[in-house]
């Protein structure tokens, strides 16, 4: 289906002509940053965001390829190095310390310089890197952690922690010999290493005694609290502060955020990771643009601005299952919330940023006609007269053998949420990939993210834009509508 | 997760109408494009028409100007309008929901359990 009028020249050249005059108007914002906005969408390498820009397009029943994303409007564009200190190919503890911490770190380390060794207890005192949240909160700004993971889970815990293995959730997850060595549970951290405004994601479970059950899922026990020491850590954190607020359904939140004697909130949906934005209950659960709206109410009220941290968890997901649905109706979603984001926002005063931490081995192409589903089948058929996907994973459980050969697939079943994409190498969980991300930046000192640059790049833009240390010398004029 | 339920299949005579109704369970509903399939005896599963959220149609050749599809997004109900009823519309009929109209006429992501239409002459 070729637009007519795409088949004309003129199109083209008075599209580029339009573009060529909106570049030529560009002007960098010179002054500080009041707020920052990091928005991290995991496992969203370009190719991602190329298939969710066709999906989005076409979820407003367009052809795709040419509906801009809200973070196709973003001014600046820089690529991203993702590769950890000990690894080509990067997990999301690693990268967390490099984009919000501004140092690069070990693979599933988080909040530590690569001097730390993974799940050794007794490397992580005196090798905490300090997270760019952490350095707002203490120049007076409100922070906030939104996800639709865990709030304990790699990515947000960059923020905030400071561990040798990710997967120390709560006391639980850890080995006698480490808490005995002092270590500290990420859930534990969550409380106590900073004073965080507002958090929202999942992960209840961490945070309860070990059977406590679920306000939700009161007779599944596999949902109940996991905590060994006993603690109800959102009881502490409640007692810390007089206008502190916890939720856990979406109702809930919605009256919270506009609660004005609320000033810290805290709302945990999930015992887990959130569901899947296909799979979410809309009266139970918000979703990652309510949430990201409900904090950045919170947030606002505070004169000296914000840092806010969202995360957009599920992407990586979807693609480690090889379901390219899944990622895809995630990353919809994502950008949905950088949209809303953008609305309540001013990018005068307002540094936002968009990128991923790592890409995934998820590739798009056979030369799908244009206007054809995303989740539709290449043209031709394969070598072995069967039928394929423009969407295809290098390696990951997609890859099945039928009578000792690939199978054929059909349209209906590609189109399923639960399809399985094909695979070139089998493996219980598709893999991150290795190449560079992209940064989309909008707002003051925007024009900072240019060219190629190491991850940990992207908290020095953030730290020098909001005048934080190290750069509390930044020489930069006070954000626009400020005074002082 | 979307289930659908399909309604209004019979026996009809050629030159004869039927309507179709699709209920959906989903509160979002309205985000999802809505589309009609069938299969005849015999044959693979076809495309008949789709509805996207913002109200683009689009029929297969064999059906256009007999059949027509529409929603009622306060019911969460799509419909399908079926005139001048023809032997070789004989099949069963699914409906079908997806991410706008390009998905759902050629990828869909959910299915209705479907309702015989049989057409004598």
């Known amino acids: 289906i070729i637009p007519v009028e795409e088949e004309n020249p003129d199109f083209w050249n008075r599209q580029a002509a339009e573009a060529l005059g909106a570049a030529k108007k560009l002007q960098p914002i010179q002054t500080a940053a009041k707020n920052l906005i990091i928005f991290l969408g995991d496992g969203m390498g370009v190719s991602t965001v190329t298939a969710a820009r066709i999906l989005k397009g076409q979820k407003e029943d367009k052809l795709g390829p040419e509906t801009p994303l809200a973070m196709d409007h973003f001014p600046y564009v820089a690529l991203s190095k993702t590769y950890s200190v000990d690894k080509h190919v990067p997990d999301s503890a690693a990268t967390a310390t490099a984009y919000l911490c501004g140092v690069k770190g070990n693979f599933q380390t988080i909040g530590l310089s690569a001097a730390a060794r993974y799940n050794q207890c007794n490397t992580t005192r005196g090798n905490e890197v300090v997270s760019v949240m952490n350095r707002a909160k203490k120049a007076g700004k409100s922070v906030g952690v939104v996800t639709t993971t865990r709030v304990q889970h790699a990515s947000p815990a960059g923020a905030y922690a400071h561990t040798v293995n990710r997967n120390w959730y709560s006391d639980a997850n850890m080995p006698g010999s480490a808490r005995r060595e002092g270590c500290k549970d990420i859930a534990t951290q969550l409380i106590s290493n900073m004073d965080i405004d507002v958090i929202l994601g999942g992960g209840r479970k961490y945070m309860f005694r070990m059977g406590a059950p679920d306000p939700e899922y009161p007779h599944d026990y596999s949902q109940d609290g996991t905590r060994m020491d006993g603690k109800n850590l959102v009881q502490e954190w409640l007692a810390k502060q007089q206008g502190a607020r916890y939720v856990w359904n979406r109702t809930e939140l919605m009256q919270a955020s506009l609660d004005p004697s609320v000033t810290h909130l805290m709302g945990l949906f999930e015992p887990g990771d959130m569901k899947y934005e296909i799979h979410r209950d809309p009266t139970l659960d918000p979703s990652l643009m309510e949430m990201t709206e409900a904090a950045l109410r919170l947030l606002s009220r505070n004169p000296r601005g914000f840092f806010l941290f969202v995360e957009g968890g599920r992407i990586d997901h979807g693609h480690h299952e090889s379901r390219a649905y899944r990622a895809l109706t995630e990353a919809v979603m994502f950008d949905d919330a950088i949209e809303r984001a953008g609305q309540l926002t001013s990018e005068e005063d307002t540094l936002t940023l968009v990128t991923a931490d790592h890409s995934h081995v998820f590739s798009f192409g056979a030369y799908p006609l244009r206007g054809s589903s995303i989740f539709g089948l290449a043209p031709g058929k394969a070598q072995d007269r069967k039928a394929y996907t423009a969407l295809l994973y290098g390696n990951g459980p997609g890859y099945v053998l039928k009578d000792g050969a690939r199978p054929d697939v059909t349209e209906s079943e590609s189109g399923s949420p639960e399809y399985r994409q094909q695979a070139a190498v089998p493996l219980d969980e598709e893999t991150h990939a290795g190449e560079d991300v992209a940064v989309f930046a909008r707002g003051p000192q925007a024009h900072l993210v240019h060219g190629v640059q190491e991850q940990s790049f992207i908290a020095h833009v953030m730290a020098f834009a909001a005048c934080l240390e190290p750069y509390t010398a930044c020489d930069l004029a006070p954000p626009a509508g400020t005074t002082d | 997760q979307v289930h659908l339920v399909e309604s209004g299949g019979g026996l009809v005579q050629a030159g004869g109408s039927l309507r179709l109704s699709c209920a959906a369970s989903?509160?979002?509903?309205?985000?999802?494009?809505m589309g009609w399939f069938r299969q005849a005896p015999g044959k693979e599963r076809e495309f008949v028409a789709a509805?996207?959220?913002?109200?683009?149609?689009e029929y297969a050749d064999s059906v256009k100007g007999r059949f027509t599809i529409s929603r009622d997004n306060a019911k969460d109900t799509v419909y399908l309008q079926m005139n001048s009823l023809k032997p070789e519309d004989t099949a069963v009929y699914y409906c079908?929901?997806?991410?706008?109209?390009?998905?759902?006429?050629?990828?869909?992501?959910?299915w209705g359990q479907g309702t015989q239409v049989t057409v004598s002459s």
């Open positions: 079908a929901a997806g991410l706008g109209i390009r998905v759902v006429s050629q990828t869909p992501a959910y």
């Open positions: 989903r509160r979002s509903f309205s985000e999802y494009a």
């Open positions: 509805i996207g959220w913002s109200g683009v149609i």
